[in-house]
Amino acid sequence: YSHWPSCCPSKGYPSEELLRWSTVPVPPLKPASLDFHSVSCRASEDGPLNSRAISPWRYELDRDLNRLPQDLYHARCLCPHCVSLQTGSHMDPRGNSELLYHNQTVFYRRPCHGKKGNHKGYCLERRLYRVSLACVCVRPRVMG
Amino acid sequence: YSHWPSCCPSKGYPSEELLRWSTVPVPPLKPASLDFHSVSCRASEDGPLNSRAISPWRYELDRDLNRLPQDLYHARCLCPHCVSLQTGSHMDPRGNSELLYHNQTVFYRRPCHGKKGNHKGYCLERRLYRVSLACVCVRPRVMG
């Protein structure tokens, strides 16, 4: 990473308005199929990708207002094995439904300390945060 | 989103050192199987998730030094259909290999304009950026 400043002053610089997130308004991201209720282990013939997958999954919210992005979603597999392409319901033990992980760049809001130890606004601290993105139907590992 | 400042001054506030990304050093994320060479349409019995998947994919780098994260990776499907769980090589026309998309929060470095139009450091502009995360084996849509 190149050196980008990570600290922002707390008071009116350059103006309160500019200190808002200066973007085209974007709604908080909600996966199309955010479903916290029980979902059966089956592959649908319609609906979003995560319900049509033969390794179906649901999304769970991870919210931290001191982090950017504030809302992240973690995938949770609904089946241990893959669902048969033929029936869409019976599981096929020849395939495993595995979580795909990703280390996402996030930023945490932290207090900034001035030269004399006094607080000077806050810092944005870059971190890698592990999220599960999806469930993938894979062939089981064959140990050598 | 709650209101977080998005602008940072350009000169020594609170100090040059503090203005560096104040984190534990993290190497740029490289998926384990970043492979830009031709890969056959088959599901491996070992290796990383994207090569063992019956909807295998490779990663392509997307680099922008004025963006955080600077490096993003896009998945590219290696097969139009899913690979048979039985053979790991023949395609099964009953399943499609589809890209899973995600609108990721990214930040762009933009000049900040002061009250008199002069530049006051830069702003971090939040945007949603579409990335393909993986390829998923799905049952084809059945149109009603």
Epitope: P28, E60, L61, D62, R63, D71, R109, R110, H119, Y122 | -
Partner: antibody
Framework: QVTLKESGPTLVKPTQTLTLTCTFS??????????LGWIRQPPGKALEWLAH???????HYKPALKSRLTITKDTSKNQVVLTMTNVDPVDTATYYC?????????????????WGQGTLVTVSS | DIQLTQSPSFLSASVGDRVTITCSAS?????MYWYQQKPGKAPKPLIY???NLASGVPSRFSGSGSGTEYTLTISSMQPEDFATYYC???????????FGQGTKLEIK
């Protein structure tokens, strides 16, 4: 100033549904970052968080009680309602509603900064 | 779920004593919050974000800690400090608020 007040039945029979209302003033639950939660305390025991609702209508529940709880808000009435189905004598407790929404120079606080006085609910036949 | 364990559960102290209450989390957390509760009353916030005093809280109260171990310290006990103290954390995934089991401070 900020005030919160819980209301609801003092006595509920087992298997019935308990409905509690939190009426608040001095803040708006439509303000970004604002949230309101329910906490209970059985007699002589510790505090137990039950449910939370955010300004944007995102809801969280204690996993062990998720199937029995529903939290809703009516921003125009300044009210948050908690319903608990299939109550049992072990649900006997003082139920509190509490606000969360403090943004300091160092960030957002996940502490409940204002609490109602609590309402004692007894579950008994 | 992250578990919080407070120790001790009961503590007898005298006016003027220095008292320390600890709160251990089952896995690492970013911040801890502390409350004081008196009989028949709602809890009152004492410490925000590990070490920041809530409004109106006397400076004899302080908080510290990181990772899995956090402490609340009362430098010199006063008669009005005899109460039950609770630690609390927020976990972002799944979003949950967790309280410790409480520490009851009694007069010796």
């Amino acid at each position: 100033q900020v005030t919160l007040k819980e209301s609801g039945p003092t006595l509920v029979k087992p298997t019935q549904t308990l409905t509690l209302t939190c009426t608040f003033s001095g803040f708006s639950l439509s303000t970004s970052g604002m949230g309101l939660g329910w906490i209970r305390q059985p007699p002589g025991k510790a505090l137990e968080w039950l449910a939370h609702i955010w300004w944007d209508d995102v809801k969280h529940y204690k996993p062990a009680l998720k199937s029995r709880l529903t939290i809703t808000k009516d921003t125009s009435k300044n009210q948050v309602v908690l319903t608990m189905t299939n109550v049992d004598p072990v649900d006997t407790a003082t139920y509190y509603c509490a606000r969360m929404g403090q943004l300091h120079y160092y960030g957002y606080d996940y502490a409940m900064d204002y609490w109602g006085q609590g309402t004692l609910v007894t579950v008994s036949s | 779920d992250i578990q919080l364990t407070q120790s001790p559960s009961f503590l007898s102290a005298s006016v003027g004593d220095r008292v320390t209450i600890t709160c251990s989390a089952s896995s690492s957390v970013s911040y801890m919050y502390w409350y004081q509760q008196k009989p028949g009353k709602a809890p009152k916030p004492l410490i925000y974000r590990t070490s920041n005093l809530a409004s109106g809280v006397p400076s004899r109260f302080s908080g510290s800690g990181s990772g899995t171990e956090y402490t609340l310290t009362i430098s010199s006990m006063q008669p009005e400090d005899f109460a039950t103290y609770y630690c609390q954390l927020y976990h972002s995934y799944p979003p949950t608020w967790t309280f410790g089991q409480g520490t009851k401070l009694e007069i010796k």
